[in-house]
Interface confidence: low
């Protein structure tokens, strides 16, 4: 018994292809690359039908449907643009992922181009089916600083020129330290900011002396010390990590990391600082920012900053030798011999940064740590040296520039 002639589906074929088919002959229906067999709303790779005894086929010929990769996955801090008209998501359609510039950039300068494959998945030549990663851009403020005047005792910072600065605030709104945003969810600050003053009789740091994550908050995008404005982002604290070799008596390794409960929205007023790429040269000019005390023991209304030079390590050691204070390799000093420009109470943990003129990018050199009084002649400010502890910071945070 002969079965009727078979027509292959559009974008498909039947095998074997014969002039005549008889009882018990079987044919396999398959589709071209990028198409799937569709039978009774079920997608499959192939479909088999058989010529029956009564001269009819066991099933109707299925259709071939173009493969659909469906809506592509969302990219955190990224955007999707469709290269194909009508936002098609079918076989050979192309999409392009990009990052929310200028605050995020794509890791490894990936093209971000993905094509809908015959298997129904979006594929990139380098990353395969994995999505690209949008990393925060560091150290490139939207508002560039005007040339610093060498003003005695600092000057008010221009709004938005220090977008990495963080305020550590008690939950009653009282600021107590500074810090810097690293990556998208970390704050680097001074370890001594995160514990209560120790008993001089028993200067051992115990867990009970540490600030609990629920005892303080981080404010980013802040300009005014106490007044709030629309650019501020208040964030909770997930976890704090003090440097394992931190010594609260000598302030060695006076650096700590604060992990945020949620990532801030990066914008013109909130942006991370870059980690240093190498050691800092003496004599280089750095900028130190904070809301700490000014001369006459007054707190400023807005963020203040000073521009000072890095001081040779041995010069700084000699300056503190009479006070029996050690300036160790994990510390870096800055200031002017005649004094007058210095960090002070309330600035601790805040950033000391420098500009890489070739790249136009700002890098973290140190965090405000300690000193003898504020702005004293022959007494330089001492900062925790970030380059010295960069490996530890990167290990804990996973942050890379």
């Amino acid at each position: 018994n002969e079965c009727p002639e078979l027509q292959p589906p559009v974008h498909g074929k039947i095998e074997p292809s014969q002039a005549k088919y008889f009882f018990k002959d079987q044919v396999l229906v398959s589709c071209d690359t990028g198409y799937k067999v569709l039978k009774d709303n079920v997608e499959m790779d192939t479909f088999q039908i058989e010529c029956l005894k009564d001269g009819t086929w066991s099933n109707k010929i299925p259709t071939c449907k173009i493969v659909d990769c469906r809506a592509p996955g969302e990219l955190e801090h990224g955007l999707i643009t469709f290269s194909t008209r009508n936002n098609l998501t079918t076989y050979k359609s192309e999409i392009k992922y990009s990052c929310q510039e200028p605050y995020y950039k794509m890791l490894n300068n990936n093209t971000g181009i993905y094509t809908c494959s015959a298997q129904g998945v979006w594929m990139n030549k380098v990353l395969g089916r994995s999505l690209p990663t949008c990393l925060p851009v560091c150290g490139l403020p939207k508002f560039s600083r005007k040339l610093m005047a060498r003003i005695f005792n600092g000057r008010p910072a221009q709004k938005g020129t220090t977008p990495w600065i963080a305020m550590l605030s008690h939950l009653n709104g009282q600021p107590f330290c500074g810090g810097s945003l690293l990556g998208s969810s970390w704050i680097v600050t001074a370890a001594h900011c995160l514990h209560q003053s120790l008993d001089p009789e028993d200067p051992t740091l115990r867990d009970s002396d540490l600030l609990s994550p629920s005892d303080f908050k981080i404010i980013l995008g802040k300009h005014w010390r106490l007044r709030s404005d629309e650019n501020e982002q208040h964030l909770g604290v997930k976890h704090t990590t003090l440097h394992p070799q931190y010594d609260p008596n000598t302030f060695e390794n006076d650096v700590a990391l604060v992990e945020l409960l949620e990532s801030p929205v990066l914008n013109a007023f909130v942006m991370p600082i870059c980690l240093p790429e190498g050691p800092q040269q003496e004599g280089a000019m750095v900028i130190v920012s904070g809301w700490g005390k000014q001369f006459l023991q007054r707190f400023p209304e807005t963020l203040m900053e000073i521009e000072i030079p890095i001081v040779d390590h041995s010069t700084c050691q000699k300056a503190y030798a009479p006070l029996k204070k050690k300036v160790t390799r994990d510390m870096i000093c800055a200031g002017e011999k005649e004094g007058g420009k210095d960090a002070c109470a309330g600035d601790a943990g805040g950033p000391m940064v420098t500009l890489n003129r070739e790249r136009g990018q700002w890098y973290l050199v140190g965090t405000v740590s300690w000193g003898d009084d504020c702005g004293k002649k022959d007494r330089y400010g001492v900062y925790s040296y970030i380059h010295h502890n960069k490996d530890w910071i990167q290990r804990v945070t996973g942050v890379r520039n």
Epitope: L171, N172, G173, Q174, S212, S214, S228, H234, E262
Partner: antibody, heavy 119, light 112 residues
Framework: QSVEESGGRLVTPGTPLTLTCTVS????????MGWVRQAPGEGLEYIGI?????DIYYATWAKGRFTISKTSTTVDLKITSPTTEDTATYFC????????????????WGLGTLVTVSS | AVVLTQTASPVSAAVGGTVTINCQAS??????LAWYQQKPGQRPKLLIY???NLASGVPSRFSGSGSGTEYTLTISDLECADAATYYC??????????????FGGGTKVEIK
């Protein structure tokens, strides 16, 4: 999302009483929860708060008089030794999300449970 | 401990009018202030936080202002439904919360 207090009743002075706040639609591991009371015809009085991480903070006047604890879906307030001054409606309230600076103003309240202390 | 002193009760105003309720703190509270509305037999409802931020679902007729120790709740275009007692709350967290979280005594608003 809701919070509901239970356990309020008439007790004699000195008899410990535990009030329970049952939450639904959200996780106590993400939110700070507080207790506030209101004596008949009087204003609101803050008792204390338990953080998402389990840290407990009491108003100075409430220390020793109340104990706050929690399980995965309930927050308890124990009145250790009630006096007639503890007669009030006790409210359980959810504070702002812990991820947003953990500020403890309350934006989700229960209807309250009435405790009457009388001999 | 911080003490919050509110405008004495009752405050009376006509429908369509404006009411202002003051809340004075005994010390600087850094705008960590919330306002609540409570109607008889009901639970309190959050209106304002951070001294001036409107809570979700609250009509813009309600507004908060102030800094330092002086704070104000203003209700404009008064409606009958606004008859209630209004409380200010100073809030804090962590070790600061022991004496930080305090309510004012409440101000009753009556609509003429």
């Amino acid at each position: 999302q809701s919070v509901e207090e239970s356990g309020g009743r008439l007790v004699t002075p000195g008899t410990p009483l535990t009030l329970t706040c049952t939450v639904s639609g959200f996780s106590l591991s993400n939110y700070n929860m507080g207790w506030v009371r209101q004596a008949p015809g009087e204003g609101l009085e803050y008792i204390g708060i338990i953080s998402s991480q389990g840290d407990i903070y009491y108003a100075t006047w409430a220390k020793g008089r109340f104990t706050i604890s929690k399980t995965s879906t309930t927050v308890d307030l124990k009145i250790t030794s009630p006096t007639t001054e503890d007669t009030a409606t006790y409210f359980c309230a959810r504070a702002r999300h812990v991820g947003s600076a953990a500020d403890s103003y309350f934006h989700l309240w229960g209807l309250g449970t009435l405790v009457t202390v009388s001999s | 401990a911080v003490v919050l002193t509110q405008t004495a009760s009752p405050v009376s105003a006509a429908v369509g009018g404006t009411v202002t309720i003051n809340c004075q703190a005994s010390e600087e509270i850094y705008r960590n202030l919330a306002w609540y509305q409570q109607k008889p037999g009901q639970r309190p409802k959050l209106l304002i936080y951070g001294a001036s931020n409107l809570a979700s679902g609250v009509p813009s007729r309600f507004s908060g202002s102030g800094s330092g120790t002086e704070y104000t709740l203003t209700i404009s275009d008064l409606e009958c439904a606004d008859a209630a007692t209004y409380y200010c709350q100073r809030y804090a967290w962590g070790k600061n919360s022991a004496d930080g979280n305090t309510f004012g005594g409440g101000t009753k608003v009556e609509i003429k």
